[in-house]
């Protein structure tokens, strides 16, 4: 497991194993197999199953070892510990950003990352692009910041900074993430919006037919979807009938903000016999599914 | 309380035919997809196919389409797997399913054993 | 066909440790994917869909997460009953498919 930190703030990690809390657990440099002490006038030291650099310093990264004594099994834990200066832009990089946020609604909340794992006292800070966030629609609220009518202007790296506070000091902690906004999808049972139910179609004897079938499915959301034509309740590849054929691939579009699914039934040269067969426009998805069904008549 | 009940365990020989059943209740069976699913012994899940009883539509995976065939029966809110002529290899343990953004609810599975 | 692929195949844990369980899909599949729990002699057992949605009765110590072609479940601390084989499954275009399933056994 990896974790990183500012120099000169604090940085507090945890071991990467789990055990129960009365379990008592070690650490130790990993190269050198030294015991990291728990006093807590060190400036690195151990608290429980916490490692605690007050403050930090490049020269601390390094792999560190945790040792987790249970009665019947003593499980070991590696943390790969990286101390990195400060930017000196306000580009922050890729290495220094926690997990992206994904806002899909119109209020949306940010989590300061990795705060909980700190003793610290609020309020906490806020930064979108390294610039103090003063408008009301944003609130920091304990470890959250809360953004009310979300846009895709509000989209960038945001940073937290709080204060952890150890022995009557007081230490810096910043950590950035990036937050991007999503439409806010719906997925919806199939809507066949043409051809119409129950329709009859007129067609002329030896000329060509092109009939859409089209149906929305929500936005966003279309999981399963699909439009298709049966005749005679037998999907067109197993009809048999060469002259009558379903266009390869679905077009798609968007309808009063819906997204849609339009399938093509091409007859080359339309027969008496056409006008007898039960031409069937399906649509479906998770939801289920829905047909239409046309007839054609002579023109 | 949702349930699906699927029938007995069954012994077959080669080339014989076999339907399996799946009995929905506590819901509306008429408005969620059932699927099936097959796992041989010791082996993994795979899906064969699906059907939506409202309008008995079905879709086969690849795998599977021309070795079974799927139908319900609405009016008695049962789903069906069928086999016109069973092989050695179509012994497993096959499980329908309903699909409603995930299979979340579950038939106890059918054990199909074809030997002679 | 979207292809599940699942790792590790084995997963050999004691009970209390962290369990992570891969699925990776050839294709994105969007968030439309599902993890089952499968104990010997029983139906498969949903536990998350739509990636991060635990289902009904579903213990706080199983999480999903990912989006697109990478997914992870997560058991946080595992408990005795936790040791069975775990599969994902896409719904996001046809034909559904599972992956081959990971087992999570006691070392």
């Known amino acids: 497991k990896s974790s990183w930190g500012l120099e000169n703030e604090a940085l507090i990690v945890r071991c990467p194993q789990r055990g129960r809390s009365t379990y008592p657990v070690e650490w130790y440099y990993s190269d050198t197999n030294e015991s990291i002490p728990t006093q807590k006038r060190n400036r690195i030291f151990v608290s429980r199953d916490r490692l605690k650099f007050l403050p930090a310093r490049v020269e601390d990264s390094g792999i560190y070892a945790c040792v987790i004594r249970s009665p019947n099994l003593n499980k070991t834990g590696y943390l790969n510990v990286t101390i990195h200066k400060k930017p000196p832009s306000c580009n922050i990089p890729d290495y220094l950003m926690y997990s992206t946020v994904r806002g899909s609604d119109k209020n949306f909340k940010i989590t300061c990352p990795t705060i909980d794992l700190y003793n610290w006292t609020a309020p906490v800070q806020w930064f979108k692009n390294c610039k103090a966030l003063q408008e009301p629609r944003f609130r920091a609220h304990r470890s959250y910041l809360f953004i009310d009518n979300v846009t895709h202007d509000d989209e960038g790296d945001y940073t937290c900074q709080f204060t952890h506070a150890e022995n009557g000091t007081n230490y810096i902690v910043t950590a950035t993430r990036s937050f991007t906004v999503e439409e806010k999808g719906f997925s919806m049972f199939p809507v066949i919006t043409n051809p119409p139910y129950n329709h009859t179609m007129e067609v002329e004897i030896g000329k060509p037919a092109s009939i859409a079938c089209s149906a929305c499915f929500g936005k966003g959301s279309h999981f399963l979807a699909d439009v298709l034509w049966q005749i005679n309740k037998t999907v067109v590849g197993n009809f048999g009938e060469a002259r009558i054929q379903e266009e390869e691939g679905r077009n798609e579009s968007s309808s009063n903000d819906m997204d849609c699914l339009t399938s093509v039934l091409r007859i080359t040269g339309v027969t008496e016999k056409d006008l007898s067969l039960e031409y069937d426009c399906l649509a479906l998805n998770l939801h289920g599914m829905i047909r239409h069904t046309i007839r054609l008549r002579r023109k | 309380e949702v349930q699906l009940v699927q029938s007995g365990a069954e012994v077959k020989k080669p080339g014989e035919s076999l339907k399996i059943s799946c009995k929905g209740s506590?819901?509306?069976?008429?408005?969620?997809?059932i699927g099936w699913v097959r796992q041989m012994p010791g082996k993994g899940l795979e899906w064969m196919g699906i059907i939506y009883p409202g309008d008995s539509y079905t879709r086969y995976s690849p795998s599977f389409q021309g070795q079974v065939t799927i139908s319900a029966d609405k009016s008695i809110s049962t789903a069906y797997l069928q086999w016109s002529s069973l092989k050695a290899s179509d012994t497993a343990m096959y499980y329908c399913a309903r699909l409603s953004g995930r299979f979340d609810y579950w038939g106890q599975g059918t054990l199909v054993t074809v030997s002679s | 066909e979207i292809v599940l692929t699942q790792s590790p195949a084995t997963l050999s844990l004691s009970p209390g440790e962290r369990a992570t369980l891969s699925c990776r899909a050839s294709?994105?599949?969007?968030?439309?994917l599902a993890w089952y729990q499968q104990k010997p002699g029983q139906a498969p057992r949903l536990l998350i869909y739509?990636?991060?949605n635990r289902a009904t009765g579903i213990p706080a110590r199983f999480s999903g997460s990912g989006s697109g072609t990478d997914f992870t479940l997560t058991i946080s601390s595992l408990e005795p009953e936790d040791f069975a084989v775990y599969y994902c499954q896409q719904f996001n275009t046809w034909p559904i498919t599972f992956g081959q399933g990971t087992k999570v056994e006691i070392k």
């Open positions: 294709q994105s599949v969007r968030d439309a």
């Open positions: 506590g819901y509306s069976f008429t408005s969620y997809w």
């Open positions: 739509f990636a991060s």
